[in-house]
């Protein structure tokens, strides 16, 4: 139904609404230098930006949340920009028996929505 | 490993951190009175509260986000409180041919975490 359709154009201006942004971080930044051996520099895609009414609503709950935030802003928070999907990353890290490669499926965001 | 474990005790005081809260809303509040027939009053469980460092981290990405927010607060937002699961709700609503019952799986939150 029409009432459930989220919108994709940002009413706040370019770059202001929920989107994917790359943040560069070292293992030291993450506090991982004692157990992760590589990569030593990570390109971390993260979800940033605001979630104005109906923008990229994740689901029915997010649409309701946006509506109720308009009515009760002190009681109900606005939806916020979080990952909708992730892309895997391989880390080489220490193990008790030496070194291993492990894929992390929930480390780097691939898409964002408002939840 | 220890570095990936989120914590469950709220350092900000009771009720301040990310949790499930029930918000009462009418069909009028939601703008649904023209197409939903019942229930006319909904008990909507929503996720509210703050996400201090490591609190109920959804996954590795959320842990990283919390860490980078501490280092670059202007660039990286803090994790925010969103549903981790939903509970289904049945709505009776109008259709072109009359009335039908429909289950919505993503309308009411059942659990919350920081993402």
């Amino acid at each position: 139904s029409a009432h459930l359709h989220p919108r994709d154009s940002c009413p706040l201006g370019p770059g202001r609404c929920c989107h994917l942004e790359t943040v560069q971080a070292t293992l030291e930044d993450l506090g991982w230098s004692d157990w992760v051996l590589s990569p030593r520099q990570l390109q971390l895609s993260m979800c940033v930006g605001e979630c104005p009414h109906l923008y990229r609503s994740a689901n029915t709950h997010a649409l309701i949340k946006a509506r109720l935030h308009g009515l009760q802003p002190d009681r109900v928070p606005a939806p916020c920009c979080v990952p909708s999907s992730y892309t895997p990353v391989v880390l080489m890290h220490r193990t008790d028996s030496g070194v291993s490669l492990q894929t992390y499926d929930d480390l780097v965001a691939q898409g964002c929505h408002c939840a | 490993s220890a570095h990936l474990h989120p914590r469950d005790s709220c350092p900000l005081g009771p009720g301040r951190c990310c949790h499930l809260e029930t918000v009462q809303a009418t069909l009028e509040d939601l703008g649904w009175s023209d197409w939903v027939l019942s229930p006319r009053q909904l008990q909507l469980s929503m996720c509210v509260g703050e996400c201090p460092h490591l609190y109920r981290s959804a996954n590795t990405h959320a842990l990283i986000k919390a860490r980078l927010h501490g280092l670059q607060p202007d660039r990286v937002p803090a994790p925010c409180c969103v549903p981790s699961s939903y509970t289904p709700v049945v709505l009776m609503h109008r259709t072109d041919s009359g009335v039908s019952l429909q289950t919505y799986d993503d309308l009411v939150a059942q659990g919350c975490h920081c993402a």
């Epitope: 892309t87 391989v90 070194v99 780097v108 | -």
Partner: antibody
């Protein structure tokens, strides 16, 4: 299992742009989050790392070649590509694509393709 | 760039006998995490290089245990405990501590 295969012209004229593609089969280029590198080997000589790209499109280049190199990824075709501009005879080499963790641990290599720069 | 120097250039070997290749870097490859960022590769005749050892001493998957890597800082050694005929080819060390990664000039191992 995952395999890499280089393709492109075997002969390029001086001053032109060398273009090569590495096709990944048996797995998705965007799954696993590896670094995808290009490495070359001049005839009878050692190995030289050219650069790498990650799933997100972020690139890393050897400073000695940076001004002439472009590496890109096409996830829809499961390929990544190398472009080397303004080539000279010194760019004649076997070009390999490889998968690594950062710029190390190249555990998977293509079979290599010889590119000759000559008029 | 970090310069990698290998010796000898050529190494004639007898099957069943041990062999040793040296690699020296122009600066220390020892990271503060305690690991040496050095890989060893073997390029068999007419083939692509294959990873043997990573992070100084860790054998890559499928590599026979007759291959071992040792050393720290600037001096590294690849040892083959008992050379087999299939071990012939050019061995390269590669530093991965700093970008760009750089390779040694190679050591050609051939059967006497």
């Amino acid at each position: 299992q995952v395999q890499l295969q280089e393709s492109g012209p075997g002969l390029v004229k001086p001053s032109q742009t060398l273009s090569l593609t590495c096709t990944v089969s048996g797995g998705s280029i965007s799954s696993g989050g590896y670094y995808w590198s290009w490495i070359r080997q001049h005839p009878g000589k050692g190995l030289e790392w050219i650069g790498a790209i990650v799933y997100s499109g972020h690139t890393y280049y050897n400073p000695s070649l940076k001004s002439r190199v472009t590496i890109s990824v096409d996830t829809s075709k499961n390929q990544f590509s190398l472009k080397l501009s303004s080539v000279t005879a010194a760019d004649t080499a076997v070009y390999y694509c490889a998968r690594g963790v950062e710029y190390q641990h190249f555990s998977l290599w293509g079979q290599g393709t010889l590119v000759t720069v000559s008029s | 760039d970090i310069v990698m120097t290998q010796s000898p250039l050529s190494l004639p070997v007898t099957p069943g006998e041990p062999a040793s290749i040296s690699c020296r870097s122009s600066q220390s490859l020892l990271h503060s995490n305690g690991y040496n960022y050095l890989d060893w590769y073997l390029q068999k005749p007419g083939q692509s290089p294959q990873l043997l050892i990573y992070l100084g001493s860790n054998r890559a998957s499928g590599v026979p245990d007759r291959f071992s890597g040792s050393g720290s800082g600037t001096d590294f050694t690849l040892k083959i405990s008992r050379v087999e005929a299939e071990d012939v080819g050019v061995y390269y060390c590669m530093q991965t501590l700093e970008a760009p990664p750089t390779f040694g000039g190679g050591t050609k191992v051939e059967i006497k």
